[in-house]
Amino acid sequence: WGFKDGIFHNSIWLERAAGVYHREARSGKYKLTYAEAKAVCEFEGGHLATYKQLEAARKIGFHVCAAGWMAKGRVGYPIVKPGPNCGFGKTGIIDYGIRLNRSERWDAYCYNPHAKECGGVFTDPKQIFKSPGFPNEYEDNQICYWHIRLKYGQRIHLSFLDFDLEDDPGCLADYVEIYDSYDDVHGFVGRYCGDELPDDIISTGNVMTLKFLSDASVTAGGFQIKYVAMDPVSKSSQGKNTSTTSTGNKNFLAGRFSHL
């Protein structure tokens, strides 16, 4: 799993990135005129994304196979990974140009810098992830994915700085899940909740995924989770390697399952 030669090796795409998101009409794909697309974005407190904003989002993993209106009457869509069914085998913004007929019907690409976002694709050597709104309590009905991909040969050292999620025996309500892979299917490491700080985790490779989910009731203080890149030369043995399991934390379910 990972990112090689600028290409994702599986299909984890962001639904929202750098403030940009895709919208379609309630009746489905390609039903919005330019004026309607503009209204949809404005209704949500944003505006139509510019070409530059869409490209900035694409660069961090925003990939949608649907043409949509952008600012100034432009139409296009962002492709991260080329494929036979979308984007004519190209990457970048597939650009249909500025449309003379604003009554044509497409989807919409909106930009809202104020929207509370969570998750994303991270390639920095170190970063801190926070639950949305931290240090305030997180909200109900949240779902966030953080996908980490470092250089080949590097590993990821994950440590929990603050941790307070709704506590229940099976961590079925609110939880953080860690995967030793670039998706939330393979390499399951553990599911965490409650207020005990989990042990550090060290990945087996250069990729890792964190998933945060909160249900429809009861919230708590949230979390801060830090990662640092470990170079191949590093002989660091501190922390907990994902290939081992821990029984020390009652709020930790560990193992290598494809699903819980």
Epitope: A25, R26, G28, L32, A35, A39, V40, F43, N141
Partner: antibody
Framework: QVQLQQSGPELVKPGASVKLSCKTS????????INWVKQRPGQGLEWIGW????????KFNEKFKGMATLTVDTSSSTAYMELHSLTSEDSTVYFC?????????????WGQGTSVTVSS | DAVMTQTPLSLPVSLGDQASISCRST???????????LNWYLQKPGQSPQLLIY???NRFSGVLDRFSGSGSGTDFTLKISRVEAEDLGVYFC?????????FGGGTKLEIK
């Protein structure tokens, strides 16, 4: 900012008609539908219907079909609702409200309401 | 028509408390594309309604994060995490999945 300014109170005789107006500003009039809602004290809110100024299309609550006529004047960004054959049951407050039927965001900004009194 | 039933009719709360209002529909509000169109409004005395939440859980522009919506299918909930004096008024739900659009009967939030 988005504003919907409704016409003043109306006093009408039973069996007569009345035409209420809703003048909008602060947004592109033709991109949003205008909904009309009836609010009777103690009986909650009832949706009458909407008109989409872009093409003049309408959608009605069957209960109000034939009783309400919805029109727009795009040059003045104003929507109108004409109510026919009024009875005392129609004495109440009527709101206009902006909506986005094609997106499903529902109804966001509302006018201040127009009070209609039906009395002989 | 989808009949919307709101409970409770009246909700006395102390300032700073959490308030929870329920809205139940006689038919599912999920459309064929999997979207659910359920909104929540607050109508303060002598004012027109103001949109708080659209599509079940999305806060409208400028709405404070003390307000949150949840639910699916036929059962929906509005929560106010820490009630303030300015939150008092009548709350109602509106479904816009089915025509005719239908409103809940309203819940009056008042000081205990």
């Amino acid at each position: 900012q988005v504003q919907l300014q409704q016409s003043g109170p109306e006093l009408v005789k039973p069996g007569a008609s009345v035409k209420l107006s809703c003048k909008t500003s602060g947004y592109t009039f033709t991109s949003y539908d205008i909904n009309w809602v009836k609010q009777r004290p103690g009986q909650g809110l009832e949706w009458i219907g909407w008109i989409y100024p872009s093409d003049g299309s309408t959608k009605f609550n069957e209960k109000f079909k034939g009783m309400a006529t919805l029109t727009v004047d795009t040059s003045s960004s104003t929507a109108y609702m004409e109510l026919h054959s009024l009875t005392s049951e129609d004495s109440t407050v009527y709101f206009c409200a902006r909506g986005l039927w094609y997106y499903g965001g529902g109804v966001d900004y509302w006018g201040q309401g127009t009070s209609v009194t039906v009395s002989s | 028509d989808a009949v919307m039933t709101q409970t409770p009719l009246s909700l006395p709360v102390s300032l700073g408390d959490q308030a929870s209002i329920s809205c139940r529909s006689t038919q599912s509000l999920e459309d064929s594309n999997g979207n659910t169109y359920l909104n929540w409004y607050l109508q303060k005395p002598g004012q027109s309604p103001q949109l708080l939440i659209y599509r079940v859980s999305n806060r409208f522009s400028g709405v404070l994060d003390r307000f949150s919506g949840s639910g699916s299918g036929t059962d929906f909930t509005l929560k106010i995490s820490r009630v303030e004096a300015e939150d008092l008024g009548v709350y109602f739900c509106l479904q816009v999945t089915h025509v005719p659009y239908t409103f809940g009967g309203g819940t009056k939030l008042e000081i205990k």
